[in-house]
């Protein structure tokens, strides 16, 4: 999930130095930017979130807001400061004419300005509710720990908190920030106003149809009776949670955001800040049968984004639309005909569908995992959710062809036991945004702050790419893939793992002069090879004969085409051991795979040789997949021979630590 790659409009207005009457002129050459929702009907012009630079204090925010009002007044414009943000993001919410944007962008401390926009509940139906009792025996599902140590915040509609299914489990906070309902004849029927939130609270923690029966919840009203809210209202809600957390620190917090709007830089930024404050955020991927990266908060990398599947583990269709998909989705969960509390009466149940329901399932699972292991970090929780998911059960044909490889084939499941997974080396695959087709275009995939990048690969549908490399960026390794001339673009694929006390570095060998190919190995004592990457400057990497072979007895070595530079990811961590596993097919094949055995985790995935007919390599769960161009177009058979190279690791240290705990 890449924060910076949404499909949104950015209007960059350069700051001019001759700004009238500014006491504090902005630093020379800085540019504040203006953003607005790409989906026109969802825009709310006239209300703007002015985001200030990170270190800005509350007093400076207030001063900047007053300055804007004064300067607007001199021009004959009325403005109203609706809210001053602090605690999550510095800034303010202002009601003003769009004519003032240029002026506002020149104010000191301004980082960017975003026009407010709508967000929506992600469930159907709103009006076709079927009252039904829970359709299973309650004693079939008795979880070992119901999430009792965890508080789940729900940002949604109002809720009927004394419904029999959730009474005493939900504390309704006094937070409310919702837009007026649309339409002059809208009739506010209480049970409909409460419908979405009541159902979701029941899915998370309901006595009889809930996932985490012991979890306590707090509700914030950010969606109106039509299930509609605003980005600004959601931001103020997230800020409220952060302030509550600071005033009265409790145990682990899960925030459920069962809503979606267009891509929003500011909403994603707020989610990032809250996540970095130790809060687990779970959100709906969206019900638009579209790329989740085009929506917020679904596109925020720090948020756990959930798509919806049905009882047959197929993606949910919702009318003409359906669940969102793509690389910004972390996993799927049940989201069709989900039974939960109905606000129609205090004992009623109803079936609703959508990615909101799917997200509520995952919020419940997260609450149970955190209750069993309260010290879990967000990265550890996400990795566990992925690890315990059902793999490869979704029929990918439902997704658009170009999204299938990017969309995780994972359906959330409760761990068989809430304890005892600590010994596992957890890894996940993170895809970058598409690079775009220009000759020098690159794509970058990043791991979460407390994950280690153990390997880096690349993929291009056209096969025209110039490989990939791991490089340092802001003190952390990232995975960068390079497009080639005439290529339609590339993806970078990072393998991100939880490896405590790891010390990793990248060793590079430039292209070899000799015909034997390029090699690089981990020469530092105690360092093991976790991944191999190769990158080349030539436009078309020809077939390299004889085929590149790894010399026997040298497992800690990456080998590649003589015209490519080879990068070895070498890591030292207590008890870490790795081995190379290869699977070569002499005849041309569109896909070659190699998997790690039980107890070993795939950390690296690459292809040999790196010739131009190889589209790329990527990890799917514990399997390394190498894709080649359609065999009918490749010509010679010798060029078609491809080897998939997997690096499989395990941590004896983690295993021992786990045994000592038991």
């Amino acid at each position: 999930q890449e924060d910076e790659d949404g499909d949104y409009e950015e209007l960059v207005l350069a700051l001019r130095s001759e700004e009238d009457g500014l006491a504090e002129a902005p630093e020379h050459g800085t540019t504040a930017t203006f953003h607005r929702c790409a989906k026109d009907p969802w825009r709310l012009p006239g209300t703007y979130v002015v985001v200030l630079k990170e270190e800005t204090h509350l007093s400076q925010s207030e001063r900047t807001a007053r300055r804007l009002q004064a300067q607007a007044a001199r021009r004959g414009y009325l403005t109203k400061i609706l809210h001053v943000f602090h605690g999550l993001l510095p800034g303010f919410l202002v009601k003003m004419s769009g004519d003032l944007l240029e002026l506002a962008l020149k104010l000191p401390h301004v980082d960017y300005i975003e026009e407010d926009s709508s967000v929506f509940a992600q469930s159907i139906p709103w009006n076709l509710e079927r009252i039904t009792p829970p359709r299973y025996r309650a004693d079939e599902y008795q979880p070992p720990d119901g999430g009792s140590l965890v508080e789940v915040y729900l940002l949604d509609t109002s809720i009927q908190s004394d419904h029999r299914e959730i009474e005493g489990r939900v504390m309704v906070t006094d937070f409310e920030n919702v837009p007026e309902e649309d339409g002059t004849r809208f009739h506010r029927q209480a049970s409909k106003c409460d419908s979405h939130g009541t159902h979701l609270a029941g899915v998370v923690s309901g006595r009889d149809a809930g996932v985490a029966k012991g979890a306590s919840m707090r509700s914030l009203r950010v969606l109106n009776c039509q299930g509609k809210g605003t980005v600004s209202g959601t931001l103020i809600g997230l800020e409220f949670i952060r302030k509550s957390q600071l005033v009265q620190p409790v145990g682990p917090l899960v925030v459920l955001l069962p809503l979606a709007g267009g891509y929003s830089r500011v909403l994603n930024a707020a989610c990032q800040r809250l996540a970095r404050a130790g809060v687990v955020l779970v959100t709906a991927a969206g019900n638009f049968r579209d790329d989740a990266c085009l929506y917020s908060p679904a596109s925020a990398p720090e948020v756990i984004t959930v798509g919806a599947t049905n009882a047959q583990d197929q993606p949910v269709t919702l009318g003409t639309l359906g669940t969102n998909f793509g690389r910004c989705v972390d996993l799927f969960a049940p989201g069709e005909d989900i039974i939960g509390a109905s606000s129609d009466c205090s004992t009623c149940f109803v079936s609703q569908s959508g990615t909101s329901q799917a997200a509520a399932h995952v919020a419940g699972i997260a609450a149970m995992m955190l209750s069993a292991e309260p010290e879990l970090t967000l990265a550890e929780l996400r990795q566990r959710l992925i690890h315990f998911s059902a793999k490869d059960v979704i029929n990918e044909a439902w997704f658009p062809e170009d999204q299938r490889v990017l969309t995780p084939n994972l359906v959330a499941a409760l761990p068989p036991s809430t304890h005892g997974a600590g010994w596992q080396l957890f890894c996940r695959t993170v895809w970058s945004a598409h690079s775009g087709p220009t000759r020098m275009a690159t794509a970058v995939a990043r791991c979460a702050p407390d994950e280690e990048l153990l390997s880096c690969s690349s993929f291009s549908r056209s096969g025209k790419r110039r490989g990939e490399r791991m490089e340092a960026q802001g003190g952390k390794l990232v995975c960068r893939a390079h497009n080639a001339f005439g290529g339609e673009g590339v993806y970078a694929i990072a393998r991100c793992c939880l490896l405590p006390q790891a010390n990793c570095s990248v060793h590079t060998a430039p292209p070899a002069e000799a015909s034997m190919g390029t090699r690089v190995h981990c020469h530092q004592q105690g360092h093991v090879l976790t991944g191999c990457s190769s990158h080349w400057e030539v436009e078309d990497l020809g077939t390299h004969k004889p085929p590149v072979l790894r010399p026997r007895g040298q497992p800690n070595q990456c080998v590649g085409h003589r015209e490519a530079s080879i990068h070895a990811s070498c890591c030292h961590a207590p008890g870490l051991e790795c081995k190379v596993k290869e699977h070569g097919i002499p005849a041309p094949q569109e896909q070659v795979t190699v998997a790690c055995e039980e107890g070993w985790t795939l950390t690296g995935c690459s292809a040999l040789p790196g010739t131009s007919h190889v589209l790329g390599a990527y990890a799917v769960d514990n399997t390394c997949v190498v894709r080649s161009r359609d065999v009918s177009t490749t010509g010679s058979t010798s060029e078609g021979a491809v080897t998939a190279v997997a690096i499989c690791c395990r941590s004896r240290h983690l295993a021992q630590a786990s045994q000592e705990l038991q």
């Epitope: 829970p134 008795q142 009927q160 004394d162 029999r164 009474e167 005493g168 309704v172 006595r207 009889d208």
Partner: antibody, heavy 115, light 109 residues
């Protein structure tokens, strides 16, 4: 602390009505409704119904449906249970209890129906 | 006629364990996680001892435990004490209401 305080004992004639009050304190009122339960002398407990403190919605037991009305006054955090057309077999101790879970109970109100 | 069936009485000596059963149907006890147990001393309101089948409210002795199998719920009191002598009632959700058992008189010999 969480408390439910009920009104005092009542003696009524058959055919009359009785209105028992229950004042709640010490918890967020809208998070729970109030259940009413009665107990005839030497008998077991009988659930009469429930009222939402959040929106005033009610759920009455079939046996008393049509004779019972439950109401709330949110300004005073008080819930009322009125039973009409009293019969001698309505003689009982009437309890209010918090929510469907009935984790906190009032002290009880004795209603005697006698001619 | 109560919807849930309890034994009219049980007895035990101090220090012993006793179990009270509460039998319903798949429409009440068997269909919901919300079986509760109440203790009532003469002239007093009932007191919640167990909720949601097996959970103890804070302040209730861990000598009291609850379980459920199919359509029957059970309350077990271990290490019987004189003050445990009382009436015990079970309750359960039904699809639209609540239902109680007829009550069990526990005598500590």
């Amino acid at each position: 602390q969480v408390q439910l305080v009920q009104s005092g004992a009542e003696v009524k004639k058959p055919g009359a009505s009785v209105k028992v009050s229950c004042k709640a304190s010490g918890y967020p009122l809208t998070s729970y409704g109030i259940s009413w339960v009665r107990q005839a002398p030497g008998q077991g407990l009988e659930w009469m119904g429930w009222i939402s403190a959040y929106n005033g919605n009610t759920n009455y037991a079939q046996k008393v449906q049509g004779r019972v009305t439950m109401t709330t006054d949110t300004s005073t955090s008080t819930v009322y249970m009125e039973l009409r057309s009293l019969r001698s077999d309505d003689t009982a101790v009437y309890y209010c209890a918090r929510g469907y879970g009935m984790d906190v109970w009032g002290q009880g109100t004795t209603v005697t129906v006698s001619s | 006629q109560s919807a849930l069936t309890q034994p009219a009485s049980v007895s035990g000596s101090p220090g012993q364990s006793i179990t009270i059963s509460c039998t319903g149907t798949s429409s009440d006890v068997g269909g919901y996680n919300s079986v509760s147990w109440y203790q009532q001393h003469p002239g007093k309101p009932p007191k919640l001892m167990i909720y949601e089948v097996s959970n103890r409210p804070s302040g209730v002795s861990n000598r009291f435990s609850g379980s459920k199998s199919g359509n029957t719920a059970s309350l077990t009191i271990s290490g019987l004490q004189a003050e445990d002598e009382a009436d015990y009632f079970c309750s359960s959700y039904t699809s639209t209401s609540m239902v109680f058992g007829g009550g069990t008189k526990l005598t500590v010999l």
